[in-house]
Amino acid sequence: GSERTCCPVNWVEHERSCYWFSRSGKAWADADNYCRLEDAHLVVVTSWEEQKFVQHHIGPVNTWMGLHDQNGPWKWVDGTDYETGFKNWRPEQPDDWYGHGLGGGEDCAHFTDDGRWNDDVCQRPYRWVCETELDKASQEPPLL
């Protein structure tokens, strides 16, 4: 059948999901497309336990997640409800700050150096994390 039981090569399994951690940086939209091209999505954090898992793997580095408010309200890329879901913003965040001088506000969420979340300019080249549910992940190793 089409159901998968293993994560792809170079992905990390955790609680029935597979995670992939970048080592380079991209703008949020490019990171989003990268994950989608891998049949995945930018990471959606649904619990404190998942937050700690991701935080452990990324370390103290700004890293994009699958949360944005580019069309108004905050939305998770997989449709998970934002209002009732897990949140871990830094104090006073999100603030849609316009003072950066880059035009517009701040519409994309990232993990900061302490793991808490901040909204920032989506064009900034941050690292990113992809996630896919285990039964959607390919178990076939890529032929390099």
């Epitope: 792809p8 170079n10 970048s22 080592r23 380079s24 940086g25 991209k26 703008a27 939209a29 490019d30 497309n33 990268y34 989608r36 091209l37 891998e38 049949d39 080249p125 959607k136 390919s138 076939e140 190793p141 890529p142 032929l143 390099l144």
Partner: antibody
Framework: EVKLLESGGGLVQPGGSLRLSCAAS????????MSWVRQAPGKGLEWVSA????????FYADSVKGRFTISRDNSKNTLFLQMNSLRAEDTAVYYC????????????????WGQGTLVTVSS | DIQMTLSPSSVYASVGDRVTITCRAS??????LAWYQQRPGKAPKVLIY???SLQSGVPSRFSGSGSGTDFTLTISSVQPEDFATYYC?????????FGGGTKVDIK
């Protein structure tokens, strides 16, 4: 040996439709994103569309969005491009291309290309 | 969209000459750049990926360099089979975009 073989090209009138196919062999097809790239006569290369390995996500150039649909059948190792509302400016050789170097953190370069199939849109 | 500009559009060389082709991106693409060779009537063939990595089976006379917005492809000593058209392509963002092509012709 990786092989990509396109078919389905031909002469079609403006406003008409055509479906291109690309038969793949020599690699684990479902593990790789695939793209269509075209080349108008005497012109350069233009990326048209891409699809993820399992087919869940698709991407298009603005010039074909809403008219072309990329799809794949992993059980048959085949890539497709459904082209509707064709225009004269769609006249080109259409190549299917395999996303290469997956260990890189990029959206793609292409390590293998088919030989191409010619699509001519003319009345 | 990211524009890719190749220069020159054509270059004339003799066998044994050193040829350098330049590709400029309209915005930073890190090192996410590939170079292709296309002979008349044939499909493109990848030469260089990630700006400077030589594809397996490609002669070592081909080399690539650069990062950010400025990249070069160098053929250290042109051989008869190298007379062809060369393209750069950025792989950082959708839509993927190619430079317009540089034709290397016999002088």
């Amino acid at each position: 040996e990786v092989k990509l073989l396109e078919s389905g090209g031909g002469l079609v009138q403006p406003g008409g439709s055509l479906r291109l196919s690309c038969a793949a062999s020599g690699f684990t097809f479902s593990s790789y994103a695939m793209s269509w790239v075209r080349q108008a006569p005497g012109k350069g290369l233009e990326w048209v569309s891409a699809i993820s390995g399992r087919g869940g996500n698709t991407f298009y150039a603005d010039s074909v969005k809403g008219r072309f649909t990329i799809s794949r059948d992993n059980s048959k190792n085949t890539l497709f491009l459904q082209m509707n509302s064709l225009r004269a400016e769609d006249t080109a050789v259409y190549y299917c291309a395999k996303r290469g170097f997956r260990f890189l953190e990029w959206l793609g370069g292409f390590d293998y290309w088919g030989q191409g199939t010619l699509v001519t849109v003319s009345s | 969209d990211i524009q890719m500009t190749l220069s020159p559009s054509s270059v004339y060389a003799s066998v044994g000459d050193r040829v350098t082709i330049t590709c400029r991106a309209s915005q930073d693409i890190s090192n996410w750049l590939a170079w292709y060779q296309q002979r008349p009537g044939k499909a493109p063939k990848v030469l260089i990926y990630a700006a400077s990595s030589l594809q397996s089976g490609v002669p070592s006379r081909f080399s690539g360099s650069g990062s950010g917005t400025d990249f070069t492809l160098t053929i250290s000593s042109v051989q008869p089979e190298d007379f062809a058209t060369y393209y750069c392509q950025q792989g950082n963002s959708f839509p993927l975009t190619f430079g317009g092509g540089t034709k290397v012709d016999i002088k």
